[in-house]
Interface confidence: low
């Protein structure tokens, strides 16, 4: 008969290195008689036999962790006891090795020049990964402004325009390398005026061009203010090159004014604004004609030729130095703006503008212009160009004039004579009368007039903006 023998661990446990999701095995070979009971602990806590994450075989001498997790790190001990002598124990460490993993990758960042930017890059891995950064195609060098923090995040103090670009972080250890996706650092710059408009002293009826140049990221928008209101006449030309916007306001000068150029750009929910002003004064202003006087003559222009009645006499305003040229220039500018509006609105707006700028004329002793009938003016505003008008008014309220569309010389409907007073004292727009029969669809617009009297038009989507100085009410 075999003699009882106290347990002896013949193969002590050793440190085991294992990768996450791999298998790790501890061997605890024991010699004894009778056969010992072997139990296992992790960090001094007993491992239960029925724990499905482990497999215990060979009478307890083999402990296998079936899929290693990073939380399995620790000290594993086997304890053998067969009732003969004392229990014996052997311990070894499990070191969970892990390829680098980026747990919090960087994200796209928009930052204002001069502020501090932090691009996160939190990593996991064993051994602890080292973190470096790539900008574009090149490794990023640290300097007095740019540092990689202990956490792996990239911190850039006093962000400059040249810091803009595409970044990615790289986490590296002995087991491998992980790359984040490319992210974009966009550097935004407050709007700044590079070239302010210059003041002018000109003769009445002259043309003046005010120029304003601004820079910023995003590229600023430029709006013009005349004596505290949006400009009521003139045309604006804009060009953008290399984040510089150049705006030129061409004015036909009939009165003095203070013109302000406002450059604005948006940073998140906030706006930055820069302003510069110039004065336009008129030499011998007191002697100029302030009252509207004029003469009747046949229309000899081109723009309104197809709109105005053939051979009709129209009123030319002598407050302009060269009335026929000045009025033709105004309508020509307006015509170009009308290219942007919907096919529904455009012919109606053309009829309105031509008949407003070149009003029918009664010669008599004092030449008298005949304004458009209020009802026709309202029909253009509220029916044919309803959507465009809403868009324009929205822009007017928010100060978002981006083109010359708000410069159209449109009459103020409420100040025009009504047909109901004297049908012979105002001009009708035949186009609207011809159009009426063809219109069958119904827009969602409100009118104070009975619905039976008005054509109902489809809503359009184009924008048609006019000067707030001529509001149709």
């Amino acid at each position: 008969e075999k003699l009882p023998k106290a347990p002896v661990i013949t193969t002590p446990l050793e440190t085991v290195d294992a990768l996450v999701e791999e298998v790790a095995t501890f061997m605890c070979a024991v010699e004894s008689y009778p056969q010992p009971e072997i139990s296992w602990t992790r960090n001094k806590i007993l491992i239960k036999l029925f724990d499905t994450r482990y497999s215990i075989r060979e009478n307890g001498q083999l402990l296998t962790i079936l899929s290693v997790e990073d939380s399995d790190d620790g000290i594993y001990c086997c304890i053998a006891n067969n009732g003969v002598g004392g229990a014996v124990e052997s311990c070894g460490a499990l070191q969970v090795k892990m390829k680098p993993k980026i747990t919090r990758p960087p994200i796209n960042v928009k930052i204002i020049e001069g502020l501090k930017a932090v691009l996160p890059c939190t990593t996991m891995g064993n051994p602890k990964p080292s973190v470096s950064w790539i900008k574009g195609d090149n490794a990023l060098r640290e300097n007095s402004r740019i540092a990689v923090l202990e956490s792996g995040s990239l911190r850039i103090h006093n962000v400059q325009k040249e810091d803009a670009g595409q970044y990615r972080c790289v986490a590296k250890n002995s087991l491998g390398t992980a790359y984040s996706k490319l992210v974009k650092l966009e550097v935004e710059v407050f709007a700044r005026i590079l070239r302010a408009p210059e003041s002018h002293n000109v003769t009445f009826g002259s043309f003046v061009t005010l120029r304003c140049t601004a820079i910023g990221i995003p590229v600023p928008t430029i709006s013009w203010i005349e004596n505290g209101n949006a400009v009521s006449s003139g045309s604006i030309q804009e060009s953008v090159k290399d984040r510089v916007i150049d705006s030129r306001l061409q004015l036909f000068i009939t009165k003095p004014g203070l013109y302000t150029c406002i450059a604005t750009n948006k940073h998140g929910e906030k706006f930055s604004t820069a302003k510069a002003a110039a004065t336009v004064s008129i030499a011998e202003w007191s002697k100029s004609q302030k009252d509207s006087q004029g003469y009747c003559a046949q229309y000899r222009g081109e723009v309104c030729d197809a709109v105005l009645a053939k051979d009709a006499l129209v009123f030319f305003n002598t407050s302009y130095r060269d009335p026929e040229d000045a009025q033709e220039l105004l309508i020509h500018t307006a015509w170009n703006e009308l290219k942007a509006v919907s096919p529904l609105c455009r012919p109606a707006a053309e009829a309105l503008l031509c008949n407003h700028l070149f009003q029918e004329c009664s010669p008599g002793v004092v030449p008298t212009p005949m304004p458009i009938c209020r009802e026709y003016c309202l029909a253009v505003k509220e029916l044919f160009c309803a959507k465009e008008w809403q868009a324009m008014e929205g822009k007017a309220h928010r100060g978002l004039y981006r083109s010359g569309m708000h410069l159209l010389p449109v009459p103020e409907c409420s100040k025009l004579p009504s047909m109901h007073r004297d049908p012979t004292a105002c001009t009708r727009l035949p186009y609207l009368d011809y159009k009426k029969e063809n219109i069958t669809t119904f827009p969602s617009i409100t009118s104070s007039r009975p619905s039976a009297d008005i054509p109902n038009l489809p809503a359009s989507t184009s924008s048609f903006a006019v000067s707030p100085a001529y509001s149709m009410t």
Epitope: N108, K181, L182, K184
Partner: antibody
Framework: EVQLVESGGGLVQPGGSLRLSCAAS????????IHWVRQAPGKGLEWVAS????????YYADSVKGRFTISADTSKNTAYLQMNSLRAEDTAVYYC?????????????????WGQGTLVTVSS | DIQMTQSPSSLSASVGDRVTITCRAS??????VAWYQQKPGKAPKLLIY???SLYSGVPSRFSGSRSGTDFTLTISSLQPEDFATYYC?????????FGQGTKVEIK
């Protein structure tokens, strides 16, 4: 290694249905948008549909709207294209491709990974 | 829908030539434009994203640029492996569109 593997193509009669699958591996599926792009024999590329794994939002070309449905199962890292009321003009190699990021961010990243394509033939 | 009009539809060139392919968008598409190369029987490969960014692993002879609504792919010195079909693609709107393709053939 990033992989996109399409399956489910084959011959189907006009008016019939097919379901294409796109099994993805090697990248974070939930941080990507998946697109189906088709190419008729001898023709150019035509975008069919997209799904943002971030939001689940779906987008369709006018030519397939109402007939095709794109979906994704993030737990299986798989995108699907259910094609109903198939027509002869739907005959093409169907590729799935991915862009990184949510739908609008991914507009800027390009379709960086593509599957090998699966042929769909609609014929009687 | 935003249309991408690609030109030319095909071109013949020799190794070492500079090749330029243009796409014109029917309306503003910001810089959400990509370029792809496709060889017969293969899936397309991304070359350029965000109008001008070179995708990793793509040779530096490929470049992209933008001027308003015009987008250009340039191959500075054509190599034998560059003979393929090239597509532009916009994803500025929620509806993605591709150009009709430009086949680059050996002269």
């Amino acid at each position: 290694e990033v992989q996109l593997v399409e399956s489910g193509g084959g011959l189907v009669q006009p008016g019939g249905s097919l379901r294409l699958s796109c099994a993805a591996s090697g990248f974070t599926f939930s941080s990507s948008s998946i697109h189906w792009v088709r190419q008729a024999p001898g023709k150019g590329l035509e975008w069919v549909a997209s799904i943002s794994s971030y939001s689940g939002y779906t987008y369709y070309a006018d030519s397939v709207k109402g007939r095709f449905t794109i979906s994704a199962d993030t737990s299986k890292n798989t995108a699907y294209l259910q094609m109903n009321s198939l027509r002869a003009e739907d005959t093409a190699v169907y590729y799935c491709a991915r862009t990184y990021g949510s739908y609008y961010v991914s507009s800027y990243t390009g379709m960086d990974y593509w599957g090998q394509g699966t042929l769909v033939t609609v014929s009687s | 829908d935003i249309q991408m009009t690609q030109s030319p539809s095909s071109l013949s060139a020799s190794v070492g030539d500079r090749v330029t392919i243009t796409c014109r968008a029917s309306q503003s598409v910001s810089s959400a434009v990509a370029w792809y190369q496709q060889k017969p029987g293969k899936a397309p490969k991304l070359l350029i994203y965000s109008a001008s960014s070179l995708y990793s692993g793509v040779p530096s002879r490929f470049s992209g640029s933008r001027s308003g609504t015009d987008f250009t792919l340039t191959i500075s010195s054509l190599q034998p492996e560059d003979f393929a079909t090239y597509y532009c693609q916009q994803s500025s709107s929620s509806l993605i569109t591709f150009g009709q393709g430009t086949k680059v053939e050996i002269k």
